[in-house]
Amino acid sequence: EKLPKAPVITTPLETVDALVEEVATFMCAVESYPQPEISWTRNKILIKLFDTRYSIRENGQLLTILSVEDSDDGIYCCIANNGVGGAVESCGALQVKMKPKITRPPINVKIIEGLKAVLPCTTMGNPKPSVSWIKGDNALRENSRIAVLESGSLRIHNVQKEDAGQYRCVAKNSLGTAYSKLVKLEVEVFARILRAPESHNVTFGSFVTLRCTAIGIPVPTISWIENGNAVSSGSIQESVKDRVIDSRLQLFITKPGLYTCIATNKHGEKFSTAKAAATVSIAEWSKSQKDSQGYCAQYRGEVCDAVLAKDALVFFNTSYRDPEDAQELLIHTAWNELKAVSPLCRPAAEALLCNHLFQECSPGVVPTPMPICREYCLAVKELFCAKEWQAMEGKAHRGLYRSGMHLLPVPECSKLPSMHRDPTACTRLPYLDYKKENITTFPSITSSRPSADIPNLPASTSSFAVSPAYSMT
């Protein structure tokens, strides 16, 4: 008769590598007498004999996992006990190996230039896959803007136009490689004006073409605004090339105006807009205004309310579709420009502009606007606003229109009637009369070039002393 023998595990468990959905087997060979009872644990939890995912054979010495799942990894132990001596145990690890799998692939993205884009790429696999990205046909290089995150996602800071293209992520480990489908990164760019329309000073009745070019993704649309309203006349020609839209507005000029080019494109539900403006002024505007039709009425606007004589009738030019509104917009635009000029110049320029745009009016059979007297215009130009006027004229000669007074509908002083010839034919500016009496701080540089044609005028220098010869009364 055999002697009782305590169990001995003759083939200890080893680490088993297994692929998902494949079979994994642990062998636990035991010598003992009587025959031992063998049980199995996974991570110290007993594996039940009736669990259909497992097969236990050879008197319990063979444990087979029939279809490995990634959750099966862990420490497996066999415990043998036959009542002789103590129970014995041997343990081994199951490492579930897995080919790379992309669980959250990237998707198509539209992003606005300058923002941050993140293309997801979440993966599974054992060993843990390394993730790289391909743009077009080339491996994507990381830099200060472009990084592959720990999660596998691709992060692009400060997205640029050149980042647009087709991307795919690649997950790789020792068992294989997985590719995502190609996705498209579209970079949208806010509308931006590349070439603003230029201001023009033209003769009445001439043709002018205003040109505005804009860029953006999607390609912007361009609309034109005239004195705040949609352009009522003129023809527009447009062309698009390489995401640049070129719009040309051809106008027949019968009145001065502020023309605004508005470039707009859409980003999802939102729009981006860029604007640029140009003025079209008419040489000898007073003359063309005088020749045009109009009516006399009280001024109802806001801008010139404090400047114009109370309850005076002013001239409204009916060559505008809405004279009140158009003239008010012109003066409002001028007013904003005047924020840049000196405190000495500003009130004088305001008085000049208001009385020029809203000329005093004689209501007769033919309503007649009364222009400003030449002497007052010159006082503003050569005394109160000498510095600004000089700067403006200098910039005009060089083709630069940037500061202070360039947008202003200023009269050409030399073309205005002199009050010395006919005091009833022109309008005085009471503000200047008042200021003349109160000026004590002007620079004492007197004119070196007297005006031959008009008496009692300062000559065209940049600053003046008020002398008795300079008479506006």
């Epitope: 009425a297 109802r300 801008v303 309850d311 809405d322």
Partner: antibody
């Protein structure tokens, strides 16, 4: 479609306050002057207040000066009328109306449906 | 404060012509008052017809016209239609001193 929708009306005791709002849509709000006009039950129209496109000035009927304040929020496309020290004679339907151009005064070419203000104890 | 005056009521036959006037209790109505005309039917908000004396708003039938008649502003309906039965208000801009926009008392027009 151009729309002006008034709100904020209701029953208030004499001496009380109300704030009317007028939400504008379907046009470029900040290009136009706006007005409030009221109509007492069974009576004619009465201009109350006006404001130009940029809110630079405000104008009022003499009897409401110092009690009513007109204002606008161009970003929100909304016109307001703050009414304080209300009197029984302020009872009316209050209409918000759009001016045909930028300045405060002129033809009112679009009107809301009105909101009723009742001042009563 | 000047009062804006209108006929309290007028009537016209369908197809007929009627003139509504708008005056001032003291003085004349001029282009500086920028006369505007409005139509209001029962239960509805007013509707602008004519602005600044004689300019018709878009969508307003050509049978409505504005003018001056003596020292008053006038609204003429030529070829009146049944749907023209309404209250008509004129409004004047008052620029002297503090600015105001003043409505007349309204004219009740009946199309018989």
């Amino acid at each position: 479609e151009l729309q002006l929708v008034e709100s904020g009306g209701g029953l208030v005791q004499p001496g009380g306050s109300l704030r009317l709002s007028c939400a504008a849509s379907g046009f470029t709000f900040d290009d136009y002057g706006m007005s409030w006009v009221r109509q007492a039950p069974g009576k004619g129209l009465e201009w109350v207040s006006a404001i130009p496109w940029n809110g630079g000035s405000t104008y009022y009927k003499e009897s409401v000066k110092g009690r009513f304040t007109i204002s606008r929020d161009n970003a929100k496309k909304t016109l307001y009328l703050q009414m304080n020290s209300l009197k029984s004679e302020d009872t009316a339907v209050y209409y918000c109306a759009k001016r045909s151009g930028r300045i405060a005064f002129g033809a009112l070419d679009a009107w809301g449906q009105g909101t009723l203000v009742t001042v009563s104890s | 404060q000047a009062v804006v005056t209108q006929e309290p009521s007028l009537s016209v036959s369908p197809g007929g012509t009627v003139t509504l006037t708008c005056g001032l209790s003291s003085g004349s109505v001029t282009s500086s008052n920028y006369p505007d005309w409005y139509q209001q039917t029962p239960g509805q908000a007013p509707r602008a017809l004519i602005y600044s004396t004689n300019s018709r708003l878009s969508g307003v039938p050509s049978r409505f016209s504005g003018s001056f008649s003596g020292n008053k502003a006038a609204l003429t309906i030529t070829g009146a239609q049944p749907e023209d039965e309404a209250d008509y208000y004129c409004a004047l801009y008052m620029g002297s001193g503090s600015r105001n926009y003043v409505f007349g008392g309204g004219t009740k027009l009946t199309v018989l």
